[in-house]
Interface confidence: medium
């Protein structure tokens, strides 16, 4: 899915640059230029773990690596919706530790909007008794579902134990795309 979206964005950039070249050539030759085909930018975001996250909500890498950000804004840990509609929202968090003490783990995706007076939890994952005491361990939590989001909704991710999160870009991420 991610690969396809990246490919689509690349194709879009390519076709846009070709369109500019073609239309300038036509102007020189004197042919009437047909109206450019308007291909709307896909609203999509895929942000990856950022190891300097120090508090909640989690902060995300929005510039380097396998990151996508198109038609959606990133602001202080949150993805900001600018167009009402149906979105698939997802997040994966990779927890691990050297010595298991079965601390309860939670992973939430929640929403804020100035039109609503408190945070609204959209998705939540909880883990308890997930490892053998004293042993090295690792566990992933994946959340994903479709939501009707409104312009100005801010989406965030929260975890209960920040120190147990592995921020590798392939392991911990947060994203969405408009259907």
């Amino acid at each position: 899915q991610l690969f396809h979206l990246q490919k689509e964005l690349a194709e879009l950039r390519e076709s846009t640059s070709q369109m500019h070249t073609a239309s300038s050539l036509e102007k020189q030759i004197g042919h009437p230029s047909p109206p450019p085909e308007k291909k709307e930018l896909r609203k999509v975001a895929h942000l990856t773990g950022k190891s300097n996250s120090r508090s909640m909500p989690l902060e995300w890498e929005d510039t380097y690596g396998i990151v996508l950000l198109s038609g959606v804004k990133y602001k202080k840990g949150g993805l900001v919706i600018n167009e009402t509609g149906l979105y698939f929202v997802y997040s994966k968090v990779y927890f691990r530790g050297q010595s298991c003490n079965n601390l309860p783990l939670s992973h939430k995706v929640y929403m804020r909007n100035s039109k609503y007076p408190q945070d609204l939890v959209m998705m939540e994952g909880k883990m308890m008794s997930y490892c053998t005491t004293g042993q090295m361990w690792a566990r992933s939590s994946y959340l994903g579902a479709v939501f009707n989001l409104t312009s100005a909704d801010h989406l965030y991710v929260n975890v209960s134990e920040l120190s147990l999160v592995n921020f590798e870009e392939s392991q911990t991420f947060f994203g969405l795309y408009k259907l």
Epitope: Y116, Q118, D119, L120, V121
Partner: antibody
Framework: QIQLVQSGPDLKKPGETVKISCKAS????????MNWVKKAPGKGLKWMGW????????SYAEEFKGRFAFSLETSAGTAYLHINNLKNEDTATYFC???????????WGQGTSVTVSS | QAVVTQESALTTSPGETVTLTCRSS?????????ANWVQEKPDHLFTGLIG???NRAPGVPARFSGSLIGDKAALTITGAQTEDEAMYFC?????????FGGGTKLTVL
Amino acid sequence: QIQLVQSGPDLKKPGETVKISCKASGYTFTNYGMNWVKKAPGKGLKWMGWINTNTGEPSYAEEFKGRFAFSLETSAGTAYLHINNLKNEDTATYFCVKYSRYYAMDFWGQGTSVTVSS
Amino acid sequence: QAVVTQESALTTSPGETVTLTCRSSTGAVTTSNYANWVQEKPDHLFTGLIGDTNNRAPGVPARFSGSLIGDKAALTITGAQTEDEAMYFCALWYSNHWVFGGGTKLTVL
């Protein structure tokens, strides 16, 4: 389906305390704030304030600061209204009202009648 | 403290369209007042109809709609039914508190 079930009517003397409960079901309790509204006999509706069911932080309308308190028992999905040092003018029906995703008061409890009389 | 004013009573007939309004003493009602409309039936049975000016609450029939008309908030019932006979209250948000109107008694004859 979503329901807000309030405790039964109460008859109190001036100076006493009353605790009204509001048991929520059919939705995630901690996602939606809870408002409290007063309706005195022959009078209109008055918004008393609300409590953030996520953080437990209450917010009171100016008129209801002091003797009134909101609290939660999150594990039971229950909100409470406490009124201390009851006065005759506290005689009213009190409603808990759920916020929806927007600033909207969508579901109302059936109301709890409190009569303060010596 | 702001005062919110509604028509004290309105009468309509089944199938007719009726509009109830809600005025603010502080000036024009805007979307920032997040106008709410609530229906009260006998025995203190309250139901939220509209929130945030025009968002219908779950399960509320499509004949109820909210809007801003001029400087007021409005509740329109398109094709009123006998069961719509009730008291209707509007509530407006003023930065940090709600103020309710006095209510409109709607009769459907």
